[in-house]
Amino acid sequence: LIIGFGISGRHSITVTTVASAGNIGEDGILSCTFEPDIKLSDIVIQWLKEGVLGLVHEFKEGKDELSEQDEMFRGRTAVFADQVIVGNASLRLKNVQLTDAGTYKCYIITSKGKGNANLEYKTGAFSMPEVNVDYNASSETLRCEAPRWFPQPTVVWASQVDQGANFSEVSNTSFELNSENVTMKVVSVLYNVTINNTYSCMIENDIAKATGDIKVTESEIKRRSHLQLLNSKAS
C-alpha cells in the first residue's frame, strides 16, 4: 500500500494505491483511492506512467479527457466514472501487455487539495491448475495442468500424509510454449501416488502462486484450487 500526500499550494489530500499484477491478454485494474469531494466537476484524475510522454488517462469535469493520452493506451483505459465521486480513481486497462509493466502515478486534484501516489504494476500470466488422476499411466499417477504462465514458474508437489517429503525424484514437469509464443502451458506428473492422501501441486513465479489440491480415496476424488497474487502491497 502506498499512501501519498499532496504538496505545496493547496492543502494536501491522501491518495492510496495498491501494487498489483496484470494477467496478459485480460483486463487489469490499477487501484487508486482518494479523499472524496462533494462535487464531481471539481475532481481531476491523472494517471501517468514512468517513461511514457503522454498521459495514461485523464478524467476531469465529470468525463474522460483524452487529448493528451499516449498512443499506447488509446482505447484501452477507463475509470469507473460512477465511483469517482466516492473517491475511487482506479483505472481499468484493456488487454494487458508485458510492456504495461512499470511504475504508474495516480495524481488527484480536488477542491480540498492535491495528492499523488505511485503504484508498481507487474505483468505476466497466471492461471489455475487442475489436478487429475492419469488413468492412462501404468501406475497410479497424478497430472497437474495449468494453461498459461509467464515468466516460467517453479512447480512443487506436496502431500498431506508425507509432509516435508521431496517429490522431485518422482515427478516430471514440462513447459510447453503456447501458440502466441509468450505464455506457456505447465504440465507436471507425479508418479507412485497412494490413495487416501491429499496431494498439492504448487505453481509459483514472481507474480502469482497457485495451488491445485486433489484428495484420492477408494470411493471418490475431491479437487480444489486457488490462486494468489504475490505483490499486492498498498502504498
Partner: antibody
Framework: EVQLVQSGAEVKKPGASVKVSCKAS????????IGWVRQAPGQGLEWIGD????????NYNEKFKGRATLTADKSTSTAYLELSSLRSEDTAVYYC??????????????WGQGTLVTVSS | DIQMTQSPSSLSASVGDRVTITCKAS??????VAWYQQKPGKAPKLLIH???TLQPGIPSRFSGSGSGRDYTLTISSLQPEDFATYYC?????????FGQGTKVEIK
C-alpha cells in the same frame, strides 16, 4: 435508453461517394467509441472502423483505409461514415454501433437500424 | 490482422438440442471475444462479451467459453426464437474482426 438513429437508404452510381449519418441519444456522446459495420446482401458482418467522438481518434480496417472517412459532430451528437469511389460490391447495409466500456474500446452493445446503400449504374 | 474462423457455417437442429459454435483466432491470445445473434432484416444483438459474460436480459441457456485461440458459444437447449445467424467478434486488438457467421436452421 441508448438510441442510434441512422439516415435513410441511398442509391449511388459507381465512382460516387456516400455519407451515412448516425445520431446518438441517451448517453454522453463524447465518452464512447462508435463503430461502423457493413453487411452485403446474404453475407456476413464486416468491421469498417471506429471513432472516439471525444477526440476524433479513429481506427480503420486496412481494406477501407483511404476510402472510408469517419467523423463526429459533438454539437449534434452525430457520427458520420463517408465512403468514396463506390463500386457495386459496396452495396450493403451499413450499421453504426456504440462500443461498450466508455473510453475503453469494448464490444458493440447498441446498434443503429442500418442504412441500405445501393451502388448501381 | 487477426482473422476469426467460425465453424460450422450452418447447422440444422431441433428445439431442445444442445448447439455449439466455435471460433478460432488466427493468432494472439486474449479474452476479448463477443458473440452476436442476428435475425433477417435486423441489426445484430450482443449476447456475450469478454468470452463468457452474458449481457443483461440474455437467457442463461446461452454461454460462452474459451481461451488462447479457441472460443465457443453454446446454446444448452435450443428454443424456437434461437433460429438465427450467430457471429463471433474479436475486439482485443486495434483492428476488430468478425467470424464468417453460423446459420442455425430448423431440422
Amino acid at each position: 435508453e441508448v438510441q442510434l438513429v441512422q439516415s435513410g437508404a441511398e442509391v449511388k452510381k459507381p465512382g460516387a461517394s456516400v455519407k451515412v449519418s448516425c445520431k446518438a441519444s441517451g448517453y454522453t456522446f463524447t465518452s464512447y467509441w462508435i463503430g461502423w459495420v457493413r453487411q452485403a446482401p446474404g453475407q456476413g458482418l464486416e468491421w469498417i472502423g471506429d471513432i472516439y467522438p471525444g477526440g476524433g481518434y479513429t481506427n480503420y480496417n486496412e481494406k477501407f483505409k483511404g476510402r472510408a472517412t469517419l467523423t463526429a459532430d459533438k454539437s449534434t451528437s452525430t457520427a458520420y461514415l463517408e465512403l468514396s469511389s463506390l463500386r457495386s460490391e459496396d452495396t450493403a447495409v451499413y450499421y453504426c454501433a456504440r462500443l461498450d466500456g466508455s473510453s475503453y474500446r469494448g464490444a458493440m452493445d447498441s446498434w443503429g437500424q442500418g442504412t441500405l446503400v445501393t451502388v448501381s449504374s | 490482422d487477426i482473422q476469426m474462423t467460425q465453424s460450422p457455417s450452418s447447422l440444422s437442429a431441433s428445439v431442445g438440442d444442445r448447439v455449439t459454435i466455435t471460433c478460432k483466432a488466427s493468432q494472439g491470445f486474449n479474452k476479448y471475444v463477443a458473440w452476436y445473434q442476428q435475425k433477417p432484416g435486423k441489426a445484430p444483438k450482443l449476447l456475450i462479451h469478454y468470452t463468457s459474460t452474458l449481457q443483461p436480459g440474455i437467457p442463461s441457456r446461452f454461454s460462452g467459453s474459451g481461451s488462447g485461440r479457441d472460443y465457443t458459444l453454446t446454446i444448452s437447449s435450443l428454443q424456437p426464437e434461437d433460429f438465427a445467424t450467430y457471429y463471433c467478434l474479436q475486439y482485443g486488438n486495434l483492428l476488430y474482426a468478425f467470424g464468417q457467421g453460423t446459420k442455425v436452421e430448423i431440422k
